[in-house]
Amino acid sequence: AQEVQQSPHCTTVPVGASVNITCSTSGGLRGIYLRQLGPQPQDIIYYEDGVVPTTDRRFRGRIDFSGSQDNLTITMHRLQLSDTGTYTCQAITEVNVYGSGTLVLVTEEQSQGWHRCSDAPPRASALPAPPTGSALPDPQTASALPDPPAASALP
């Protein structure tokens, strides 16, 4: 079965710093979303080989990519306190598959000692349930993102 390996499980960074999240799969996917979990999950990026990536406007000018959709590293720059949260990779395959999640803790520089990551991965219960449908979603319409490629700061 298709799996998404995601790292790191957790990272603590000061305001203004950058963080790398890596999503790796065994291939055979259409594309990959990075989704911020929460009461209203939000798609942060959509990446597909050969397609101009899409980035949510909140991250305008703050995202970089390296690698390919099978082994993608996403860099988020100039982190803000409001960026704190759990980010999960979602591979678009015949059945959507989720990574284990990365908890990003953005802290004020002075209070870094107060917030530390444990070694345990984010709790699985925090992840959304996989979709029931098996049809390939169309990333042009299915995402919370407006149609992929449509602005930001880098197509």
């Epitope: 990026i45 050969g50 397609v51 101009v52 990536p53 899409t54 980035t55 949510d56 406007r57 305008r60 000018g61 703050r62 995202i63 970089d64 990519f65 390296s66 860099t75 720059h77 042009q140 993102l145 407006p146 149609d147 992929p148 490629p149 449509a150 602005a151 930001s152 700061a153 880098l154 197509p155």
Partner: antibody, heavy 125, light 107 residues
């Protein structure tokens, strides 16, 4: 007012090198992607390369891949295009262009708006 | 590579006439199509983005429509300053590509 001023064009022999610069003003340069687009004399527009706001991610058109390098110095508010192994078919006016400034949109690369006035590169022996 | 085909290559018209320019795309680009205007000796200027949105400062006589693979730019009534070359561009896939352009000239 946003301003983009290209420089560095000129006459160069086939196989030679040239570095184009694009000095930006009137906006927060470090927050926007930038691109190079060229236009051969009497011809249409051809996208050459784009670079993310941080400079860490770059994209190239196949005809220039491996020969051209896009880069930026955000502290100097300047975009560069290093052109090596130049060929006659690289002869063109080279424009730098800023990512469109619309917060209502999302995406990693937006439309080209505005453009600089262009600088002419002529590759000939 | 996505190929954009503009037609006609040249249009000879008079001020006040209505203009419809076509841009046909080799595969779907959703709504990720823009139109630029270029006058002789000048840099291109963004007119329409995401198929139908007018860029800042662009007069209402310019409008865009279409979806998928067929797009049009309409100028409701040609003004003397509208005589120029018009290019469409997609940014759905790499590489970013432009159409060959349509020249709108004075009859």
């Amino acid at each position: 007012e946003v301003q983009l001023v290209e420089s560095g064009g000129g006459l160069v022999q086939p196989g030679g090198s040239l570095r184009l610069s694009c000095a930006a003003s009137g906006f927060t340069f470090s927050r926007y992607a930038m691109s190079w687009v060229r236009q051969a004399p009497g011809k249409g527009l051809e996208w050459v390369s784009s670079i993310s706001a941080s400079g860490a991610t770059t994209f190239y058109a196949d005809p220039v891949k491996g020969r051209f390098t896009i880069s930026r110095d955000n502290s100097k508010k300047t975009l560069y295009l290093q052109m090596n192994s130049l060929r006659a078919e690289d002869t063109a006016v080279y424009y730098c262009a800023k990512d469109q400034d619309f917060d209502i949109l999302t995406g990693y690369l937006n439309w080209f708006d505005p453009w600089g006035q262009g600088t002419l590169v002529t590759v000939s022996s | 590579e996505i190929v954009l085909t503009q037609s006609p290559a040249t249009l000879s018209l008079s001020p006040g006439e209505r203009v419809i320019l076509s841009c046909r795309v080799s595969q779907s680009v959703s709504s990720y199509l823009a139109w630029y205007q270029q006058k002789p000796g000048q840099a291109p200027r963004l007119l329409i983005y995401d198929t139908s949105n007018r860029a800042t400062g662009i007069p209402a006589r310019f409008s865009g429509s279409g979806s998928g693979t067929d797009f049009t730019l309409t100028i409701s009534s040609l003004e003397p300053e509208d005589f120029a070359v018009y290019y469409c561009q997609q940014r759905r896939n790499w590489p970013l590509t432009f159409g060959g352009g349509t020249k709108v000239e004075i009859k």
